[in-house]
Amino acid sequence: EKAMVDGSWLDLAKRSKLEAQPFAHLTINATDIPSGSHKVSLSSWYHDRGWAKISNMTFSNGKLIVNQDGFYYLYANICFRHHETSGDLATEYLQLMVYVTKTSIKIPSSHTLMKGGSTKYWSGNSEFHFYSINVGGFFKLRSGEEISIEVSNPSLLDPDQDATYFGAFKVRDID
C-alpha cells in the first residue's frame, strides 16, 4: 500500500514537472506580414489560436523569451509561395532564407543560431511556385534570452499556420 502511495506521488511529481516544462509553438500572423525583399524581422506571431500554444515562456515584441535556464530544442519552418493571381515577380532570381537569432539583454549581443534556405529561379512561365525551409537544433538558453525569426522576401511567405511557424521546448536542465 505504501509503495502504491509512493508511486502515485512520484507520478504526480513527474507529471507536474512535465507540465512546468517550458514550450512554445508560434504561428505566423498573416494579417501583419511585413514587406521587403531584404532580410526583415518577423514580429507578429500567434501564441494562443489554432495550433499555436505557449507555456512557461513569454512572447513579447515579436520575440520568444526564455523564462527558465535549460537546454532547448528550437525549430522553425518557413514556406514561401507565389501564385500568378497575386501578380508577377519583379525578379525571377530569389534568395529565400530564414535566420533564427538569439539576443541576450544582460550582455547585449545577438547571434544567429540557425539559418537555412536557398537561391531559387522562379520562372515567370510557371503559374505556381513553392519552397519550404525547416531548421532545428539543440541550444543552451538562459532566462531572459530572446529568440526571433528573420526572413528574406516576406511578401512571399505562405501565411498558413501549418506552413510558417517556429517553436521551442525545454529538454533538460543545465547541470
Epitope: 514587406s35 525583399s37 493571381t85 501578380g87 519583379a90 525578379t91 530569389l94
Partner: antibody, heavy 126, light 103 residues
C-alpha cells in the same frame, strides 16, 4: 506630388515605329515598376507590358511580344515604350502607369496602377 | 488566360441614385481586383484596389465588394462628376467597361 508626364501625340505610317516617353517625378523612380496600357477607339483597356525601373526586368503581353521594347533611364526618371511594325489597329491612346507596391518593400508587381500619365495618342495611317 | 466580364455595358441613372456595376472573372482571383474611372481626355484614376480598399483621395460614396469570381462597384449617391466609364481589372486583364450617364 507624384506625376507621370508623357510625350505628345504621334502620327505614323503602317510599318513604321513609335517611341513614347513617360517622365516620372515626385517619387523614387527606381523603387517602382512602370506599366504600359493602351486603349484603341471603342475598345477596352489593354495591358502591354511592364518594366521594373530598379533592375530593368521586363514582361510583355504575348500579343506584343517581338515588336515591343520597354526601356528606362534612371538618371532621367523616364520610361520608354517603343512599338515596331505599326498597323492601323495600333491606333490608340497609350498610357504609362505606376505600379503601387514599392519594390523596396516587396517583390511582387501587383498590377494596381495608382498614378497614370495623361496618355499619348498614336495614329497609324497611310 | 483570365477573362473579365462587366455588366451592364452602359447605364443611365439620376443624380443621387445608387449605382451598382458587376464584374465577373472566368476563374477565382481571390480579392485581386481593382476598379478604375476613365474620363475622356483625362488620365485614368484608381478607385478601389484589392476588391474593397478605397484608394486615398477617392470619395467615400465609392465602394467595392466581392471575392472569388464575382465583384461589385457601388456608387452610393451618383454625382454629376461621376459621369465616366468604369473598368474592373485583374493583373493583365480588364473588363470591357461600363459607361455611366446621367438621366
Amino acid at each position: 506630388q507624384v506625376q507621370l508626364v508623357q510625350s505628345g501625340a504621334e502620327v505614323r505610317k503602317p510599318g513604321a515605329s513609335v517611341k513614347v516617353s513617360c517622365k516620372a517625378s515626385g517619387y523614387d523612380f527606381s523603387n517602382y515598376a512602370i506599366h504600359w496600357v493602351r486603349q484603341a477607339p471603342g475598345q477596352r483597356l489593354e495591358w502591354m507590358g511592364w518594366i521594373n525601373a530598379g533592375n530593368g526586368n521586363t514582361k510583355f503581353s504575348q500579343k506584343f511580344q517581338g515588336r515591343i521594347t520597354v526601356t528606362r533611364d534612371t538618371a532621367a526618371s523616364t520610361a520608354y515604350m517603343e512599338l515596331r511594325s505599326l498597323r492601323s489597329e495600333d491606333t490608340a491612346v497609350y498610357y504609362c502607369a505606376r505600379d503601387s507596391p514599392n519594390m523596396v518593400r516587396g517583390i511582387i508587381i501587383a498590377y494596381y496602377f495608382d498614378y497614370w500619365g495623361q496618355g499619348t495618342l498614336v495614329t497609324v495611317s497611310s | 488566360e483570365i477573362v473579365m466580364t462587366q455588366s451592364p455595358s452602359s447605364l443611365s441613372a439620376s443624380v443621387g441614385d445608387r449605382v451598382t456595376i458587376t464584374c465577373r472573372a472566368s476563374q477565382s482571383i481571390s480579392r485581386y481586383l481593382n476598379w478604375y474611372q476613365l474620363k475622356p481626355g483625362k488620365a485614368p484614376r484608381l478607385l478601389i484596389y484589392g476588391a474593397s480598399s478605397l484608394q486615398s483621395g477617392v470619395p467615400s460614396r465609392f465602394s467595392g465588394s466581392g471575392s472569388g469570381a464575382e465583384f461589385t462597384l457601388t456608387i452610393s449617391s451618383l454625382q454629376p462628376e461621376d459621369i465616366a466609364t468604369y473598368y474592373c481589372q485583374h493583373t493583365r486583364a480588364f473588363g470591357q467597361g461600363t459607361k455611366v450617364e446621367i438621366k
